[in-house]
Interface confidence: medium
Amino acid sequence: ASVGLPGDSLHPPKLSTQKDILTILANTTLQITCRGQRDLDWLWPNTPRDSEERVLVTECGDSIFCKTLTVPRVVGNDTGAYKCFYRDTDVSSIVYVYVQDHRSPFIASVSDEHGIVYITENKNKTVVIPCRGSISNLNVSLCARYPEKRFVPDGNRISWDSEKGFTIPSYMISYAGMVFCEAKINDETYQSIMYIVLVVGYRIYDVVLSPPHEIELSAGEKLVLNCTARTELNVGLDFSWQFPSSKHQHKKIVNRDVKSLPGTVAKMFLSTLTIDSVTKSDQGEYTCTAYSGLMTKKNKTFVRVHTKPFIAFGSGMKSLVEATVGSQVRIPVKYLSYPAPDIKWYRNGRPIESNYTMIVGDELTIMEVSERDAGNYTVILTNPISMEKQSHMVSLVVNVPPQIGEKALISPMDSYQYGTMQTLTCTVYANPPLHHIQWYWQLEEACSYRPSQTNPYTCKEWRHVKDFQGGNKIEVTKNQYALIEGKNKTVSTLVIQAAYVSALYKCEAINKAGRGERVISFHVIRGPEITVQPATQPTERESMSLLCTADRNTFENLTWYKLGSQATSVHMGESLTPVCKNLDALWKLNGTVFSNSTNDILIVAFQNASLQDQGNYVCSAQDKKTKKRHCLVKQLVILERMAPMITGNLENQTTTIGETIEVVCPTSGNPTPLITWFKDNETLVEDSGIVLKDGNRNLTIRRVRKEDGGLYTCQACNVLGCARAETLFIIEGVQEKTNLE
């Protein structure tokens, strides 16, 4: 036989049997010769257990590279693969030998000593119970207990192979405590050894690194990374770490199990990586991998090593922040720093402390921003190690969506008389200034009214006042600008040339921050008119009357009602004139009817008016033809009685003969006080030189004479008493003699 030289291809050794599978009977002798090109060795089943005494390997006499394997008195357990191979190579020839032993069809292998089968509860996993056979074509089933269950090969996932054993999906036997294989030969039943079933967990729920994300350190500091794995029970776990630096001498890894909390269905494992003194070469990605045999999970973090402490603002820092009034403002601080800096906020130079409206820290939060909050905010960062400081200023601009002044007022309930000219205004404050104010309108009957809501009027669509179709004749005047309450406001006015149609008008103001609107009810009536007598504003305890005048040809059933606080049901209707629909809910007043040639006049007299008489009074009249009720509302305001007061000082005056003296006696009081002037305690009477104006408030003395000097007293009196104030007139100069010829 030729010797194989290096470089030549190595042919597998040749066996004396040509078959891949050899079947022999028990108690006979097995002999196989192997010939090859270099040194040979044999491997046979259960090699480690049976020492060489039963198996003989001998040199052939006729060839240098030839060995014969002899096994006398073979038994079923000798069934298996017999392999002849070249030393130090993978080149081999194999024959599988079945030793047919009908008394012992199952082979017990070396590893079967323990008789343990490890399985995982995985639907896709199969397990092999190693009950190999000494006969290739046995009918084998698997018995599991307890409860007792038998599994038969199904030609699919359940099978028996004499060389491997019984294969079955692991979940099918996960309930069992033990399993064994069973074969039937000539009505005789044979069993393999018992295998204990151990369910092994494999699921890793998660792997968590602490600290997570990115870790920042300065050179020389200690790094401690904890890797915690949470698994199901019955799991064995291996950890491995990947890290940047190849120098391992300064790294220390400790793995340990963590005691699970009682009642938990998870197991915890911890691996700790420690570097006592980090260097720049330790910077990089650190990955912790946990492996359970069937499952791998990993997590990673980045360790950044700085050569020294530092501080700087990030590029994303804004210099201008705009916010809408009422919103929450957040001004984040973006910085690059190691270690984390101390952060201090200042507003217009003053430090800001956290309170219920402002929270300071990594970001400045203003809970509900107001215009007062506008200004310059400065954030100062301090590095706690190096004490280096950095500052950045942010200007906060607070935008105000349009606020319509009249919205704050309770809309007057007065109706508008047919055919009259009326002016509607919207006073708007907005910051930044308005893009525009637009006016819209819609017919009263095209809208619905729900007084309980914030905005009681709902119109499906609004029509621009430039849509001239169907409303009152309108003119929008040029916007006026006025400083009101210290704010620049825009006043937009809508002039209704003649009130013919009941409508709703809406002014809509828009700026960068949003929009505001005000809906004005413009209810036109062609009916009764309300007047107050006397025309002056009434004061308590005075006598006064409310007159409701209606055309006798058009109206009948004139009635006065008071819209009292008890009349809440008034607000339940859908109509835009809900008062008229709920007259029964109002307090009916007794009035006196007078008539003239064209009108009926219903008068409610207040002999001794009190503050309780204030409120909204409704005059109702019924259209004779249509029977429709018309209602008119008048708000009656009664002034509280007030004793007279002199509201300013009367200054002493010095003047020269022939000049004019003017003095005003500023008074207040209800009813309006009666003013009397005295000179040196004598009542002052008007003459050619002494003039009293504005209800005697203004005293003028023209071409003063020496004798006009003296003590002047102003006295203001009403039913509650009098008030007095005095002034001294000093007249200087010499009286000229008048020549009367």
């Epitope: 047919y418 819609q442 017919l443 009957e445 095209a446 430039k466 001239f468 179709q469 169907g470 004749k473 309108i474 003119e475 929008v476 040339q497 013919y500 149609v501 009941s502 062609r526």
Partner: antibody
């Protein structure tokens, strides 16, 4: 689609009466001012009368005041023109139109006053 | 009452020409309550312009309204054969409403 359809025109003797109707569709009739405009043969346009949405206010040309009455029934989406004491000079095509300026017109109905 | 006067009575122009129609009110028309109409023979009028300068829906942009107070103008920038019609102005500022006498535009 907005549509206005006049009816009621015809031949009438001087001093007689006619009632014109205008059926409206395709819009919310009760929201709009409605009017009548006439055009005598070979002449220009002449406004006759207008009525406000709820029917509460009406306006008339001096030439028809006291003789013609404009009215509307919002529930029926219909505009009317009652013409009494008709004269020869009232002969014209009468158009029903929507609005203060007239954005939609009917095709007109001819009224002839002649003995 | 407001009287409306239109000029010229007739305007004879070629296609592509610019037509300028004038309308004068006897007193000021507030807030530009003025409209322009086009009427072709045998048809009802149709509105072109309202509010003195606002084009009505579907009206080509060659029709432009301008003016305020007492003097108003309708301009047709490039005349087309279908523009041959009578054009009326109308004030709707105050009652009684009134139309101008009309301007007839002929295309040569």
């Amino acid at each position: 689609e907005v549509q206005l359809l006049e009816s009621g025109g015809g031949l009438v003797q001087p001093g007689g009466s006619l009632r014109l109707s205008c059926a409206a569709s395709g819009f919310t009739f009760s929201w709009y001012v409605m009017g009548w405009v006439r055009q005598a043969p070979g002449k220009g346009l002449e406004w006759v009368s207008s009525i406000y949405p709820s029917g509460g206010a009406t306006n008339y040309a001096d030439s028809v005041k006291g003789r013609f009455t404009i009215s509307r029934d919002n529930s029926k989406n219909t505009l009317y023109l009652q013409m009494n004491s008709l004269r020869a000079e009232d002969t014209a095509v009468y158009y029903c139109a929507r609005g203060n300026y007239f954005d939609y017109w009917g095709q007109g109905t001819l009224v002839t006053v002649s003995s | 009452d407001i009287q409306m006067t239109q000029s010229p009575g007739t305007l004879s122009l070629s296609p592509g020409d610019r037509a300028t129609l004038s309308c004068r009110a006897s007193q000021s028309v507030s807030s530009n309550y003025l409209a322009w109409y086009q009427q072709k023979p045998g048809q009802a009028p149709r509105v072109l312009i309202y509010g003195a300068s606002t084009r009505a829906t579907g009206i080509p942009d060659r029709f432009t309204g301008s003016g305020s107070g007492t003097d108003f103008t309708l301009t047709i920038s490039r005349l087309e054969p279908e523009d041959s019609a009578v054009y009326y102005c109308q004030q709707f500022d105050s009652s009684p409403l009134s139309f101008g006498g009309g301007t007839k535009v002929e295309i040569k």
